[in-house]
């Protein structure tokens, strides 16, 4: 059976039906994807340009595949099973009158059905299933997948993975504002900032006075203590953690299977035994890895280390002297942690703009 071999999928609404407001169409597809993400580990992100895994379009008649639409009634839509190119795409017959109510053809109900195909589900012979081949109106506000639908989609992707809750350990390490406090790794995780140190991490919402502390093992039993570098790709909900010659991927706060992997698979030379610090710059779509006196640059789009690296930190980051403990990307600046201090660095103008205590994030 066809299935996507990844958990994070993109979709794009290529064009819109004139029958409905654009924002209604956007909302309906968001909710239709949510129907499937609620019962699986799958996560969906909307693109506004470029090729997405699942391209959604409205069309009359012939529209670029062998499956011409037949005018009003009859075939309402069709979708392709998972795979590259046209595969995974969902096409809606523009000859229908698409609505968000019981009149015409309810877009939400047809979208849930077609996206089931886009995820690999076949038609069901159970009339209660959303994958039953015949359209019938159900109230979208009370719509629920049948047990059949849930069982079938979970046979492809498994059950949803609940993100663990961040709890406070019983004996938190003492004072933040200790003069010489340094961090092993610092990164954003969604709206929070995580400060890794030994076997625990502090986390806080910027601007909020509250600071929380959690042991690494209590939230991620498979992740070792002593994390040395970390970065987040927020648009994908991905967190990467590094220790020695290994790295781990945390998806939506859940460790991904088949990790750890070797850092050499990213393109590091054999001379690199550990990464001191890492930061992802979303504007450039690059990860900067700091290793002793040098830094490496990784292209996340191509999944390749950029050629001509490593380069000297001191040459390309004026005002920054090795060695670096941690780097945080926050509001278009890099915060470069070195011992008890951090440097606020503007990558656009390539200069240090502030020197702060490393604990300044905690109101120290």
């Amino acid at each position: 059976r066809s299935r996507w071999m990844k958990r994070y999928l993109t979709y794009r609404i290529y064009n819109y039906t004139p029958d409905m407001k654009r924002e209604d169409v956007d909302y309906i597809f968001q909710k239709a994807f949510q129907v499937w993400s609620d019962v699986t580990p799958l996560r969906f992100r909307k693109l506004h340009k470029d090729e997405a895994d699942i391209m959604i379009l409205f069309a009359f008649g012939a529209h670029g595949d062998f499956n011409y639409f037949d005018g009003k009634g009859g075939t309402l839509a069709h979708a392709f099973y998972p795979g590259p190119g046209i595969q995974g795409d969902a096409h809606f017959d523009e000859a229908e009158t698409w609505t968000k109510s019981f009149q015409g053809t309810n877009l939400f109900l047809v979208a849930v059905h077609e996206l089931g195909h886009s995820l690999g589900l076949q038609h069901s012979n159970n009339p209660k299933s959303i994958m039953y081949p015949t359209y019938r109106y159900l109230n979208p506000s009370t719509f629920r997948l049948s047990a059949d639908d849930i069982r079938n989609i979970q046979s492809l992707y498994g059950a949803p993975v609940k993100p663990p809750s961040l709890t406070k350990p019983s004996s938190p390490p003492s004072t933040f504002c200790h003069q010489s406090l340094s961090f092993d790794a610092v990164t954003t995780v969604g709206e929070k900032i995580f400060f890794f140190k030994d076997w625990f991490f502090w986390w806080k919402l910027p601007g909020s006075p509250a600071t929380n502390i959690t042991s690494i093992s209590s939230i991620w039993p498979s992740i070792p203590s002593g994390i040395q570098a970390a970065y987040e790709i927020e648009s994908r909900n991905q967190l990467f953690l590094f220790k020695d010659e290994k790295y781990w991927l945390i998806n939506n706060l859940v460790p991904e299977p088949h990790y750890p992997r070797s850092i050499y698979s990213l393109g590091f030379s054999a001379s690199v035994k550990k990464v001191d610090a890492a930061v992802f710059d979303p504007l450039r779509q690059k990860v900067y890895f700091f290793v002793d006196k040098h830094y490496w640059r990784y292209d996340v789009r191509q999944e390749l280390m950029d050629p001509a690296y490593p380069k000297l930190i001191s040459t390309h980051f004026p005002g920054i002297k090795p060695k670096i403990d941690a780097v945080l990307y926050f509001k278009r600046h890099y915060y470069i942690f070195q011992g008890a201090y951090q440097l606020e660095y503007d990558p656009l103008f390539r200069r240090v703009t502030k020197t702060l205590k490393s604990t300044s994030w905690f109101g120290c």
Partner: antibody
Framework: EVQLLESGGGLVQPGGSLRLSCAAS????????MSWVRQAPGKGLEWVSG????????FYADSVKGRFTISRDNSKNTLYLQMNSLRAEDTAVYYC???????????????WGRGTLVTVSS | DIQMTQSPSSLSASVGDRVTITCRAN??????LNWYQQKPGKAPELLIY???SLQSGVPSRFSGSGSGTDFTLTISSLQPEDFATYYC?????FGQGTKLEIK
């Protein structure tokens, strides 16, 4: 390694018949749409016919509709093209091509055979 | 019915040149356009699918772009092995081909 091997081509008189075969190997044949595409000598590519994984759905170019029949035998991993009432303009190299899997065909031909030459001449 | 018009029908160029071939549909085909390369006496090979996705194993000097009705295939730096005929295609419709010859 995906392989498609056409056979059954040859010289045939106008009005005659010919059956082409395409033996597939190196992939699971049954879930994929398959097509025949032809190329007249010195000319461009022309899609001829396509068939669904189960064989239940078939498509034909207008130029061959009613004369050609596409079929498949999934137990033998083989695609067929039965060509009747052949005309001089059917002279071409006939290629079989693998399409995508699933309920609908896209015409994304990622693997092709080497082709078999059909010559219709008196 | 959808028709595909490819231009130019033939093209002379030199090794190292940047070459662009265009394909136009008479109505929107969204991003459902594929490009194939065919060398004399050989079967066609898929280069680009879904307008811009490079087929596995195809050199990165080949790229595709476009959506709706207008599409292009670009070869950034011609290599000797790239002299061939190129076809655009969507579903059952092929363009008439562009023969790329050595200048």
């Amino acid at each position: 390694e995906v392989q498609l091997l056409e056979s059954g081509g040859g010289l045939v008189q106008p009005g005659g018949s010919l059956r082409l075969s395409c033996a597939a190997s190196g992939f699971t044949f049954s879930p994929y749409w398959m097509s025949w595409v032809r190329q007249a000598p010195g000319k461009g590519l022309e899609w001829v016919s396509g068939i669904s994984p189960s064989g239940g759905i078939t498509f034909y170019a207008d130029s061959v509709k009613g004369r050609f029949t596409i079929s498949r035998d999934n137990s033998k991993n083989t695609l067929y093209l039965q060509m009747n009432s052949l005309r001089a303009e059917d002279t071409a190299v006939y290629y079989c091509a693998k399409d995508i899997r699933g309920a609908y065909s896209s015409g994304l031909f990622d693997y092709w055979g080497r082709g078999t030459l059909v010559t219709v001449s008196s | 019915d959808i028709q595909m018009t490819q231009s130019p029908s033939s093209l002379s160029a030199s090794v190292g040149d940047r070459v662009t071939i265009t394909c136009r549909a008479n109505q929107s085909i969204y991003t459902y356009l594929n490009w194939y390369q065919q060398k004399p006496g050989k079967a066609p090979e898929l280069l680009i699918y879904a307008a811009s996705s490079l087929q596995s194993g195809v050199p990165s000097r080949f790229s595709g772009s476009g959506s709706g009705t207008d599409f292009t295939l670009t070869i950034s730096s011609l290599q000797p092995e790239d002299f061939a005929t190129y076809y655009c295609q969507q579903a059952g419709i092929f363009g008439q081909g562009t023969k790329l010859e050595i200048k």
